[in-house]
């Protein structure tokens, strides 16, 4: 009888020990299984979870625009006054709704190439007005012409055309014209076959971005989604030195198992450069734990503050000998047009940049760019890309519309907020397939370990107690 009880207690302790050991073993084995599954599923090839979402994003992406409406155009043109602007928006478009095209796997170098078609659909219900709303903005062609043709003879010729077309420093244009293109009356007088259509994003609809060639991760998962080449080249040919490199991914995803200490590098064709984001905070996105990576102010600093940025300063006059910060001259990437990119409202820009403009209110929360990355898969589940498009306008003695200017201006035209958030359904699916399974496995591991240890200890105590009783 005593033996039965003792045997039972020992059996219980053994079972507990087995459960605890099994739970303990399950930890590294489970992690290995998870890693293996993740590695298999994030590879960019037919049949994987990643590939399905990669070809056509399951996230609805919106691009909101705020236009800087100039309140005192005549005063600026006549007296070189400060430009008073008032932002109007949002005007919202749905973007990135088209699937990637010309997808070609290269099994030799483990890459996949594709183009990303561009398209934009106006969303009236998410906008403050219609595409026909009018704005007073800088005359893009008039501002760009003397910058492209710094030759005084040609400037006299262009002045004749500007006068004939009754163009001036500022113009009134509808949202649709400003964003997607309009026939410019001044350029239409040039007696050569040149493009006479002007627009901040012209041409956009029915165009493609790429060709991108990215690593599919089949041979090395730590390279998945990293861009191997863009438009057939490993460099951009826009910047000197290492600034010209195409680094990282396209920001839609990153190699899995993202650590907080990691710097996420990505390339954005919108800003014609590679950039980076650093860990900001941990947040909960629809029940999914994600890491919020933010673009640091350092990325927009002058070479004085951040020597790594020296090769992004390609022009010495406007940048005050590379001491100004917060604006990026992307003219080389825009056929020589004087286009400058910044954060909205000149956030993180030097005072000399924003000084000639009145009506700007930079705000970290509203105007910064961030990426919410799920650390296990490396998928970007939410993002907000914010940037501002500015045009440089300089005094030009030979062009009457610009001859009264006493200083150059980096004129804000518009700023945009491109956002995407994983949908509720997709989030649930993600939780079920990824975080849910990992949580469940963790719980099973802990339960087995916990129950096993408790059983082992309890049965051993009982056994010892029993033995000592019998001994007495």
């Amino acid at each position: 009888m005593g033996c039965d009880r003792n045997c039972g207690l020992i059996a219980g302790a053994v079972i507990g020990a087995v459960l605890a050991v099994f739970g303990g073993i399950l930890m590294p084995v489970g992690d290995m299984l998870i890693e293996k599954t993740i590695k298999r599923e994030v590879v960019l090839e037919e049949g994987t979870t990643a590939f399905k979402n990669w070809v056509k994003t399951g996230t609805t992406v919106y691009r909101q625009f705020w236009i800087f409406d100039v309140q005192n155009p005549d005063d600026v043109a006549k007296n070189s006054s400060k430009i008073k602007v008032k932002q109007r928006g949002p005007y919202t478009y749905r973007v990135r709704y088209l699937a990637k095209e010309n997808i070609t796997q290269d099994p030799e170098d483990h890459t996949v190439s594709f183009v990303q078609p561009n398209g934009a659909i106006f969303e009236p219900s998410l906008s403050v007005g219609t595409e026909d709303d009018n704005f007073t903005v800088l005359n893009l062609a008039v501002a760009a012409a003397p910058h492209i043709y710094q030759n005084s003879f040609v400037q006299v010729v262009l002045n004749s055309l500007i006068k004939k077309s009754k163009s001036s420093m500022f113009q009134t244009r509808s949202l649709k014209e400003l964003l997607w293109g309009y026939k410019d009356p001044f350029l239409s007088l040039v007696p050569y076959p040149i493009s006479t259509t002007v627009g901040v994003f012209y041409p956009y609809n029915d165009t493609v971005d790429g060709v991108y060639k990215v690593f599919n991760g089949k041979d090395n998962i730590s390279k998945v989604a990293i861009i191997e080449s863009y438009k057939g080249k490993r460099n951009l040919s826009y910047w000197p030195s290492y600034c010209d490199m195409i680094n990282g991914t396209d920001a839609a995803s990153f190699p899995p198992f993202v650590e907080k200490s990691r710097t996420l590098r990505f390339f954005s064709s919108d800003i014609c450069r590679s950039i980076y984001a650093v860990f900001g905070s941990e947040i909960d996105l629809k029940g999914i734990p994600v890491y919020r990576f933010v673009l640091p102010a350092n990325a927009f600093a002058s070479p004085l503050q951040n020597p790594d940025n020296h090769c992004f300063c390609t022009e010495k006059v406007i940048s005050n000998n590379c001491t100004s910060y917060g604006v990026l001259d992307i003219g080389k990437c825009k056929e020589g047009k004087p286009v400058y990119i910044s954060l909205p409202h000149f956030l993180h820009a030097s005072p000399d940049v924003s000084e000639p403009i009145e009506g700007l209110h930079p705000n970290e929360d509203e105007h910064r760019t961030y990426l919410d990355v799920e650390p296990i898969t490396g998928f970007t589940l939410q993002f907000a890309k914010r940037l501002q498009v500015n045009i440089l306008v300089k005094p030009a003695r030979k062009i009457e519309a610009l001859k009264n200017l006493k200083r150059p201006y980096i004129v804000p035209i518009l700023w945009l907020n491109e956002t995407g958030t994983i949908g509720d359904e997709k989030a649930e699916m993600f939780k079920t397939q990824v975080t849910g399974k990992i949580k469940l496995l963790g719980m099973v591991e802990m339960a087995l370990l916990g129950i096993g240890v408790v059983m082992f200890v309890a049965f051993m105590i009982s056994y010892c107690a029993c033995k000592s009783k019998n001994g007495k």
Partner: antibody, heavy 117, light 107 residues
Framework: EVQLVESGGGLVQPGGSLRLSCAAS????????IHWVRQAPGKGLEWVAW????????YYADSVKGRFTISADTSKNTAYLQMNSLRAEDTAVYYC??????????WGQGTLVTVSS | DIQMTQSPSSLSASVGDRVTITCRAS??????VAWYQQKPGKAPKLLIS???SLYSGVPSRFSGSGSGTDFTLTISSLQPEDFATYYC?????????FGQGTKVEIK
Amino acid sequence: EVQLVESGGGLVQPGGSLRLSCAASGFTISSFGIHWVRQAPGKGLEWVAWIAPYGGYTYYADSVKGRFTISADTSKNTAYLQMNSLRAEDTAVYYCARSFFGYFDYWGQGTLVTVSS
Amino acid sequence: DIQMTQSPSSLSASVGDRVTITCRASQDVSNWVAWYQQKPGKAPKLLISYATSLYSGVPSRFSGSGSGTDFTLTISSLQPEDFATYYCQQHSNAPLTFGQGTKVEIK
């Protein structure tokens, strides 16, 4: 086909006047602007005068300023060079030429102006 | 005014020779330089604009190079029809100015 034809040259006494014409076909002179370039016998090319597109601007070489006037009649698609107070050193073949960006892609055949007593 | 100085003022060469004519501007004209060919009794003909851009219909044996103040016209293999006078011209600033010309003669 683009063509420029000069006329109006001839012999004139010092101090006299002459009006050269440049009839254009195959393009609109107002869109491009027209230049007059001259070449003295056995010498190089000398730029003389220019009327910018749409008549928005006229420009003259220092050697002819105040004596020569360039003009255009868009209805006739013809440019003119009115030459007053002519001097012996104005003797040359006068060419009209088309230009937009400052280089001359089409030239007339030239008309000879001789200033002599 | 911008002075354009051409050299040499004349040269003798044979058919098939490589010929180089240089032109120096008195100040920076970027790439705003054109080259012309003129035969006796005829109007000049445009060969090159923007220092390097070959005008349509001009044989590829003609080429231009240079930027800033120093420019070159090269004829890679001289042909019988190339014996003429060549002029450079800056189209950067008014007044537009020409070089004094280089006469290419048969050796």
